[in-house]
Amino acid sequence: AGTRSSRARTTDARGCRLRSQLVPVSALGLGHSSDELIRFRFCSGSCRRARSQHDLSLASLLGAGALRSPPGSRPISQPCCRPTRYEAVSFMDVNSTWRTVDHLSATACGCLG
Amino acid sequence: AGTRSSRARTTDARGCRLRSQLVPVSALGLGHSSDELIRFRFCSGSCRRARSQHDLSLASLLGAGALRSPPGSRPISQPCCRPTRYEAVSFMDVNSTWRTVDHLSATACGCLG
């Protein structure tokens, strides 16, 4: 069965999951000067499947333009894809000093709220 | 002290909080036909104050355009302002039937994730 090809089941390909990317330490805003790259893991994707009745109605109201909300603080009508666990990341700075930053990278994600 | 006016302290006026609005039942997407209004409470506002080291670095990476993320699923670099408690809401439909919808309105908010 594992080798048989079949029609793909409908899955939320954009669903909440852990993603990773090589990024320059200099772009992390840590205040450490470094030319190194590190692997940064983060969470992104949709949490539509986990919506409550409140969320469904909120989405309906937002879609209908029926809710007034302050500029820049539009309410969120689904749980958020957020890290549930973190890990430390280490790198070498320009002075060849080994630096470790706790809770920098995500190691697990969940639909929260 | 309660009656004294003083120079405003810098506070997060746009912070995560409970808001309320009268909305038409017809805009709630419940499948019930009704021209009534109900009071709908929802959560909105910023959770910037609760950001972790991961969030700060994620925000820095996003700001620098250093992260690739799938269209429509940009990662969130702060906890989400979401309901932590809900309440039922009741209304009259067009047939004068009293309807109650559980968990429709928020009663408390928090910065989650």
């Epitope: - | 009534e36 209004l37 309440e87 004068s96």
Partner: antibody, heavy 122, light 107 residues
């Protein structure tokens, strides 16, 4: 647009009667309670009374100062509420507001009319 | 009847000031407390519902807090349009009652 419009305010002599109307538009109020609140010139707000919805058998309650003299009624088919005022006194002189209170675990005066002036004077 | 006592009855402040108005109930009313603003010649307008919920469309500089018998309305940074009269109101018991009002005036 959601609104309430009061009418019927007038100058009346002490001991006289007056009937105020409150018409709702832009929504249906049959599931809501209808309240009346008044405000004498330069004074604070005073709750007059309310009529509840059909589910609560259109029960009415009144403030102590008007009990036995004022009667609140409603006609849901016309989306209109009424305040019948009898045995009017000089101290009943005020702006009268009708207010919708939608159902909720905690209630508030949600939608206010613009007010209608009742003057009791000889 | 539940008595609602507001203080102060009036206050003078300047644009940009932080202002706090208090409301005390004669018995516990949980969070069955609403705040209204009234402009001259107009009906009151709901600002804060259920002690602390900001009514949509009301600026975020307004906030409410409290439970039981003691409540506060705070305006974090007074704006010119905020110089009006404010009322608290309880909906815990019939008859619903209001505070006597607080007039916020320009210093």
């Amino acid at each position: 647009e959601v609104q309430l419009v009061e009418s019927g305010g007038d100058l009346v002599q002490p001991g006289g009667s007056l009937k105020l109307s409150c018409a709702a538009s832009g929504f249906t109020f049959s599931g809501s309670a209808m309240h009346w609140v008044r405000q004498a010139s330069g004074k604070g707000l005073e709750w007059v009374g309310r009529i509840r919805n059909k589910v609560h058998r259109y029960a009415t309650e009144y403030g102590a100062s008007v009990k036995g003299r004022f009667t609140i009624s409603r006609d849901d088919s016309k989306n209109t509420a009424y305040l019948q005022m009898n045995s009017l006194k000089i101290e009943d002189t005020a702006v009268y507001y009708c207010v919708v209170v939608v159902p909720g675990s905690i209630e508030a005066f949600d939608i206010w009319g613009q007010g209608t002036m009742v003057t009791v004077s000889s | 009847d539940i008595q609602m006592t507001q203080s102060p009855s009036s206050l003078s402040a300047s644009v940009g000031d932080r202002v706090t108005i208090t409301c005390r109930a004669s018995q516990s009313i949980s969070t069955y407390l609403n705040w209204y603003q009234q402009k001259p010649g107009k009906a009151p307008n709901l600002l804060i519902y259920a002690a602390s919920t900001l009514e949509s469309g009301v600026p975020s500089r307004f906030s409410g807090s409290g439970s039981g018998t003691d409540f506060t309305l705070t305006i974090s940074s007074l704006q010119p349009e905020d110089f009006e009269i404010y009322y608290c109101q309880q909906s815990y018991n019939i008859p619903w009652t209001f505070g006597q009002g607080t007039k916020v005036e320009i210093k």
